[in-house]
Every structure is written in C-alpha cells, then in structure tokens.
C-alpha cells in the first residue's frame, strides 16, 4: 500500500490512569488514540495480551470503541486475580504504534476478620482507658471510627482521641461505661469488630477516715471508716502492718473497728485498708492509751525503832509513766526522785519512786504519802512509819514444845510435855476435851516444866488433851489426842530435841498486801536434822490473844500468807517438821502492817460502808452435825445494813493432828442468806466455827466463835 | 471459549510416577490459579493442591506434600502435575481446575484416569 | 484443618421434589462455600459460589444459603436431569465434603 501525505502514526492522547476499584464493580481504563488511519487497539496486561469480548463473547472485559477498556465487574479471588495488575494500552496503524503509560488496576479489598479485635477494659474512674483495634486487612488501607453503644463517637471531644487504631479517653468517668465497636472501612465498605465493653470502676475513697484517739484503759473506743467505690470495696483493718489479733476487736456492718475495753497493748496504728479491683486506698489513725497510775509494789506501814533507816518502796505503772512524789501528811514539802539532797535532810527520793529516811526520830512518825501523777489520772497511798524504843506489843506466850499424839496400852503412863516461854514468864495448865483437867484424880499431875503425868490408864483416858500457856500478854494453846487401847504402849516416847529439826532463821518479810504478807526464811543451823515441812504461825493483838496456825505443810523457805486482816499488825514464826515431831519456833518476825483497805468501787463511799459493815451484829448459833463429816452453821443479823455482799463462814479445825490450822472460808454470796452446810470435815475432830460479814474487800466485824465437835459415826436418829 | 484439556489415560505400576498436562486456552493463563482434584473410583473429590502460573507458588495439603509437585510453562499456557511413588490406592481420575476470581472452579478438565496396578 | 460434613450421604426423591442438602464446618468459614454437580463419568460443575450466588448458566431452582458453620443448597423442583452427586467445598482450605447421591425414588 502506498502512503498517503495525510496519514500518521498512532499517538495516545489519553492514557490510562491508576484506579482502585471495588471487587465485583465497574470499572474502565480509558485510552484515546490519534492517527491515520484510525489507529486499533490492544491492551496488556503485565505484558500479557488481555482477552475482551472481542476474544469471548462471554468475556466480562468490554473493549470499547474509544479504545477504552471497561470492566463490567472486576473479578478478584482470594488467590485467582484475574483483573489485578499493569496495564497498557498499544494504538497501531500501518505507520507504526503507540504505547500509553503504565496505569495499574488495584482491587479494593476489605477482609472480614479484624488483626485485633477491641477486648473488654476495666478501668478506675478519671485514669485514661485505652481500646484498641486493628481493622481487617484492606486495600486501600481501612481506616477506623469507633462507636459507643452503636452511635459513632466524636473524637473532638478533648478527652477522646483516635490515633492508629487505637481509642483514648484521657480521664474516664462513669458515663464512659458502654459497648465499644471498632469500625473498618475504606471504598469496599465497613466492617463492624466484636463489641467490647469498657468498665468505668470507682478506685475506693473515704468518706469518713478513721481519726486518732486518745483513751484511758478499759473505755471504749471505735475508729470509724466510711469508703464508697464501685464495686463495692471490701474493707479490712490491720495494727501495726499485721492482721489484727482474734478476740479483741469487733467489726461492725458499717466497718467501724471497736475496741470495747482498750488495754495497753492496744496501743498503737490502726489502718483501714479499702479495696475493690481498680484500687486500694489505706488511711490510718493511731490510738494511744492512757493508763491511770497503778501501783506495782505500794508502801507498807512500818515499825521501827529510832536512829535506824526506813525504806518505804513505791512503784508504779502507767501510760504515760507517772511521776512520783512523796509527802508527809500535814507537810507542804514534796520530794521529788533525783532532787538534790537539802542539807540536814534525811528523806530522799530514789529514781525508782522509793522514799528512805535515815536515822529515824521520833518525830518522823506519821503518815508518808506517796502520789503518782499522769495525764491520765494521780493515785495515793499511804504509810505509816511507826517509830519505837521496844516494841510494846508483846506476844502472847510462845510454847516451845507441846504435847504429841500417841497410843498407849491400858495400865501404862503417859506423859504430854508442854515447855513454854514468854514475857512475863506463862502460866502451864491443862484442858481435856475443853474442861479444866486434872482436877482431883490422883492418877494426873502437872510437874515443873508443865509436863502432864497421867499414870495407871484407863480406856477412858481417850481424849483431846490441851496446854494452855498463859500470860497477861495472852495465851497459846496446842493440842494432843491420847488414845489409850489394849494393845499400846505401855509409856510415852520422850522425844529428845536431837530428833527433831533446829529452828528455822527469824522470818523476813518481803512482801505486804491488804490480806497477805509474804515471808522467807532460811532451815535450822547445819549440823541439825533437815526440815520436811514447815508451819508458820501468827499472832496479832487485834485479831486475838493467842498465835494461830496459819500455814501447814508448807515445803517451800518463801510463803505467802493470806486471809490476813486489812491495816493490821502482825508477828510471825516458823517451825519445821520432821517424822519426829516440831523444832522449836524460829526467832520472831519484825512487826508488819498489812495494807490499808484500797479505796472503793466508784459511787460507793468507803466510810459509808466500812460504818454500816462495823455495825452489823451477827450472832452464831450453835452448828448441827448433820453427818460424820457435814456441819450445819446458821446465824441472824441484828440489822441488815445496805452494803453486804454476803457471810464469810470461817472454820478451823483444833483437835487432832492440825489443831489450830488456818482459818478456811466458804462464802455465803447471798445477802439475805442465814445459813450454811460445812462440807468434807473430818471425822471425830473438833471445829472452831466463826462468821464474817463483806462488802467487796470491805469486812465487818466477826461473830462469837462456836466450836463442834464431828462424829465417828453416822448420829442416831 | 474458554476451556482445560488433559492429557490420555496412564497404566502405572506402584513405586512409579505419573505426569499428567493440563492445557488451558480461551483465557489469559496466568491471571487464575489452577487445582488438581482427584477421585478414586467409587469415592469423592480430593483436592491436591494448586499452582499460581504467575509465578510458580504451589501449595499442597499435608497428605500429598513430598509426592506431589506441580509446574507450569506459560509460553504453552500448560500446567502440570506430577505423582510420585505410587500405590494402587492412587488409581483415580486426575482433574485440572481453574479457580475463578469467586474463589471457585469454574472451569475443569475432562478428567485423566492414572490406573496403578502390577 | 477445617472438615466439612455433608448430609445426607445419599437421599431418594420425585421429580417436582423439594431437595435440601446441608453442609456444615468444623469452624466458621463465613461465606467461603461453593456447591458443585456431577454426573457418573463427568467433571463437576460449578453451581452455586460463595454461599449463595448462582454461576452464570446454571437454572435458578438451584439456591445456596447459609454463613459461618452451617449451609445448605436447595433444589426447588427437582427435574430428571438434576438426578446426581452434589458436592459442598470450603474457599478458605479447599477441602470438598463426602458428597450426596440423589436417586429417583
């Protein structure tokens, strides 16, 4: 064919351009080409001929007739992506083609499932929560909005933002609470992520924070702690960084800690610790108890002889720790512990709160108060410093040794020895079963060191002997029984005093209470047979004219007496035992005071009580032997006053081996009671009976003592 | 129009290998992933894996993986699939398919019948 | 792996019949499921494509429904030439299931 002057090559005056489109959309590349004669068209794709209905008929690829390539919907797979790629598109005449740009066909695509869905948040209110979300794969590349409770959320919020997938509210409140929804899109559409669900907690606070507190021992006290927070905070409290110790404490429904009667140890920081699943918040308070004054070892009246040093101790204990002074009764002048001595002054003041004068006049007689001082209270006590040349109160008479128990045959002599000793010099005579004895049997004589003599025995004989050794100072008495049988011997053992144990040392006393005084000793000298037991007996002028057993059996060189009388002076001795019999007495003790009677109960006026308890009038009537080994004792009151708690019943046992033992009690707790049954006595023994009116220590005067003898045998009836 | 043609029936005896062809026309070639399917005689359809005659990229499900190995020429727009060590329990009708851009064969072979037997 | 269990394994029927054959997966295979006919000595084809959509050519008796574990292909009215094997298959990992004969009764 020949050319003709007005033909030319292909030229492309519009080429493709790039375009994402939608799988399953319409698409079309356009190409524009000039050229004579009029230029066809091909297009390829990544260098490969693409077939249109040109080709197939059934082809979904439409070659139009501007050149353009139209797609009546773009077919792309998961792996076959028949449409995706570079295409071109070649305009060709017989002068020659022309080749347009490259422009790319990319498939929009927006995948079902999300790289990361949004997962459920707990957070505290006002802490910033963070959702976050990447979209399904995509291209173009999905972007995201959110939706809360399925309305889309306005990130101009100040405290919202959305940055790459993720959601951030800054400072959460409650009303944040809701269902979250991650949302994909891009030109193929949107894809909605599981929902999530954001928890706006409340981190627990107070509403009332426990507040420290400042009490007295035994008052109640309660550290309140008020928490709100959702959900609900459990609440728990500890002391001192630990678990609170069992018992002590009560927790109420409004979580408030009570302590119903504080104790010292309860001292200390208490912490109220609230917590739920966003937080924990603690708030403490301490608590300090304040503990009146207490007196550990309180002073004790004293006798003492002039020129010599007393000692009056003085200790106490508290919260905070008193402070100590003493005072003389009648005294402006204090002394104070570590105060430099005053010239000529004999009084100071230990740091331990112990008042010591030296060189006693008489003129430092009189009472000595010590006070302790706190915030939390002052108590007193007082002490009376008694100053002597002699001690006037002498004892009755001391009965070195007294007759034994024994059995002897019918016929034979016995012998009951009674040696006695005093100022003035006692008086020997004898009782049998309570009655003057010997009267004018010609069988019994008393000789010179007051030994009883009783030849030619008779069975009825048998009995309860008693020496009494008396004096203008008083009297003592101790008791034997004598069994005379059969089958006995014929005439008394005579104990040498090598066969019985040496005396004990002279008692020291170390301690005083109200009821009590404690004594310690030290066995007979060496080379004297050893102690098995001691007893120990004590005498006071005010309780009676005469020592009393107040100890029996006692295995120990250190013994606290008890069942003592309140502000009363006493004397004590100690003797020791063997299988032989007693030694002789030890050397007496220094005179003790027992403690003075503590103040009363709150609302109760010592005196009030102390007069109406030494007006009361009990009269003892005669005990009933109910069985062998059971005593009936019933009494009246002349007036029944308002202050009596109860009858102390006390009884004593003074025939038989323990003639003369300590005093026992059974208390009748019942003010309107008027009777009561001594019980486990024992058989054929005789009983010193007594009763004592008491108000808590308060004790009233005793009644005339009563004495009963039980019976072997069951009584006839 | 578009269509796969396979090529004749095998007779092979166990431990040997098969290669079966599978030409396609009507269709630019390596815009669609081809699949090999087989089914034994009496049973169902097995898929055995498939090809991208792009680039060549083959997948397999565990069971063929080390026997089966698939190729292509794109200049005769042909794909193949190779079996090796045979068993009689390989004895099937061997088919080629196209995988549309639906995710789905649209277009199959007439099927290749490889007989395994000593 | 994810299986695909096809029920029933084989079913008769009438001409004009209503025929449901249910496919299900082990795990969600969203709308990834295809159906396909074939006839004795025949290759399959292709008639329904992502759950629900009919290939071009194939008669509209033929439906597909179902997403996520549980499809089913229903012929509406069955005809004499509907009379062979239909298979379900996964997109996703390709695996076809067992298979259902339907037989003139």
């Known amino acids: 064919s020949r050319l003709r002057q007005e033909d030319f090559p292909p030229r492309i005056v519009e080429h493709p351009s790039d375009v994402i489109v939608s799988k399953g959309e319409p698409t079309t590349l356009n190409c524009k080409a000039e050229g004579r004669p009029t230029p066809t068209i091909e297009w390829y794709k990544d260098g490969e001929r693409v077939e249109t209905d040109k080709d197939d008929p059934r082809s979904h690829r439409m070659l139009l007739p501007s050149g353009s390539l139209f797609f009546l919907r773009i077919v792309h797979g998961r792996r076959s992506k028949p449409d995706e790629g570079s295409y071109v598109c070649v305009a060709r005449n017989y002068l020659g083609e022309a080749v347009s740009r490259n422009a790319s066909l990319e498939v929009a695509l927006l995948r079902d499932d999300f790289r990361q869905n949004p997962t459920d948040v707990v957070v505290a209110a006002g802490e910033p929560a963070i959702l976050e979300c990447q979209p399904p794969r995509g291209h173009p590349e999905p972007t995201i909005y959110w939706k809360k409770d399925k309305v889309r959320i306005d990130d101009k919020e100040e405290r919202i933002s959305i940055r790459g997938g993720k959601l951030m509210i800054s400072n959460t409140r409650k009303s944040d609470a809701g269902m979250y929804t991650c949302v994909g899109t891009n030109m193929v559409g949107e894809r909605d992520s599981d929902p999530a669900e954001l928890t706006v907690f409340e981190r627990p606070t107070f509403l009332r924070r426990p507040i420290n507190q400042v009490v007295l021992e035994e008052e109640a006290v309660e550290f309140r702690c008020q928490v709100q927070g959702d959900p609900q905070p459990t609440v728990r409290w500890k002391k001192d960084d630990a678990d609170l110790p069992r018992g002590r404490y009560d927790i109420k429904d409004d979580y408030t800690l009570r302590i119903k009667k504080t104790m010292s140890t309860d001292e200390g920081t208490y912490m109220c610790i609230a917590e739920n699943r966003v937080g924990k918040m603690e708030a403490s308070a301490t608590l300090t108890v304040r503990a009146p004054p207490q007196f550990v070892v309180r002073p004790r009246d004293q006798i003492v002889a002039q020129g010599r040093t007393v000692t009056f101790p003085c200790e106490t204990k508290g919260n905070p720790q008193p402070a100590v002074f003493w005072q003389k009764e009648g005294s402006q002048n204090l002394l104070f512990p570590n105060q430099p001595q005053q010239p000529n002054s004999r009084c100071s003041v230990s740091p331990t709160g112990d008042l010591t004068i030296t060189n006693i006049q008489r003129s430092d007689a009189g009472y000595y108060i010590c006070q302790a001082l706190t915030v939390a209270g002052s108590i007193l006590a007082k002490a009376q410093l008694e100053v002597t040349d002699v001690l006037t109160d002498r004892p009755p008479p001391i009965i070195l040794q007294g007759p034994a128990n024994q059995t002897l045959a019918v016929d034979g002599t016995a012998l009951l020895k009674c040696k006695a000793t005093g100022d003035p010099l006692p008086v020997i005579s004898w009782l049998k079963e309570g009655f003057t004895f010997p009267g004018r049997d010609p069988r019994a004589t008393i000789q010179e060191q007051g030994t009883l003599q009783i030849k030619n025995l008779r069975i009825s004989d048998t009995g309860t002997y008693t020496c009494v050794a008396t004096s203008s100072s008083g009297e003592t008495s101790w008791s034997a029984v004598l069994d005379v049988t059969e089958s006995g011997a014929t005439i008394s053992k005579n104990y040498d005093l090598s066969d019985l144990p040496g005396p004990p040392s002279k008692p020291q006393v170390t301690d005083v209470t109200k009821n009590s005084v404690t004594l310690s000793w030290q066995p007979g000298t060496p080379g004297t047979l050893p102690a098995s037991a001691y007893i120990i007996e004590a005498f006071s002028q005010s309780v009676s004219n005469s020592w009393q057993t107040v100890a029996n059996h006692v295995k120990t060189t250190l013994y606290t007496v008890r069942g003592l009388r309140p502000n009363t002076i006493y004397l004590f001795m100690v003797r020791a035992i063997n299988p032989q019999g007693l030694s002789d007495p030890s050397p007496m003790s220094d005179p003790v005071r027992t403690q003075d009677i503590s103040p009363p109960a709150q609302g109760v006026d010592h005196r009030q009580v102390q007069k109406e308890l030494g007006d009361v009038l009990v009269r003892l009537h005669n005990p009933v032997v109910l069985t062998p080994t059971t005593v009936q004792v019933t009494w009246t009151v002349d007036r029944q006053p308002q202050f009596i708690q109860g009858y102390r019943v006390m009884y004593r046992q003074t025939s038989g081996l323990q003639a003369t033992s300590s005093w026992q009690n059974l208390d009748a707790k019942v003010p309107t009671e008027r009777s009561a049954v001594l019980v486990n006595l024992k058989k054929g023994v005789t009983y010193e009976i007594k009763v004592r009116p008491y108000f808590n220590e308060f004790q009233g005067m005793d009644s005339e003592s009563k004495t009963v003898r039980t019976t072997e045998e069951a009584p006839s009836a | 129009q578009v269509q796969l043609v396979q090529s004749g029936a095998e007779v092979k005896k166990p431990g040997a290998s098969v290669k079966v062809s599978c030409k396609a026309s009507g269709y630019t070639f390596t815009g669609y992933y081809m699949h090999w399917v087989r089914q034994a005689p009496g049973q169902g359809l097995e898929w055995m894996g498939w090809i991208n005659p792009k680039n060549g990229d083959t997948e397999f499900p565990q069971k063929f993986q080390g026997r089966v190995t698939m190729t292509r020429d794109t200049s005769i727009s042909t794909a193949y699939m190779d079996l090796s060590r045979l068993r009689s329990d390989d004895t099937a009708v061997y088919y080629c398919?196209?995988?549309?851009?639906?995710?789905?064969?649209?277009?199959w072979g007439q099927g290749t019948m490889v007989t395994v037997s000593s | 792996d994810i299986q695909m269990t096809q029920s029933p394994s084989s079913l008769s029927a009438s001409v004009g019949d209503r025929v449901t054959i249910t496919c299900r997966a082990s795990q969600s295979i969203s709308s990834y499921l295809n159906w396909y006919q074939q006839k004795p000595g025949k290759a399959p084809k292709l008639l329904i494509y992502?759950?629900?959509s009919l290939q071009s050519g194939v008669p509209s008796r033929f439906s597909g429904s179902g997403s996520g574990t549980d499809f089913t292909l229903t012929i509406s009215s069955l005809q004499p030439e509907d009379f062979a094997t239909y298979y379900c298959q996964q997109s996703v990992g390709l695996f076809f299931g067992g298979g259902t004969k339907v037989e003139i009764k």
């Open positions: 992502a759950a629900s």
């Open positions: 398919a196209r995988e549309s851009g639906d995710d789905a064969f649209d277009i």
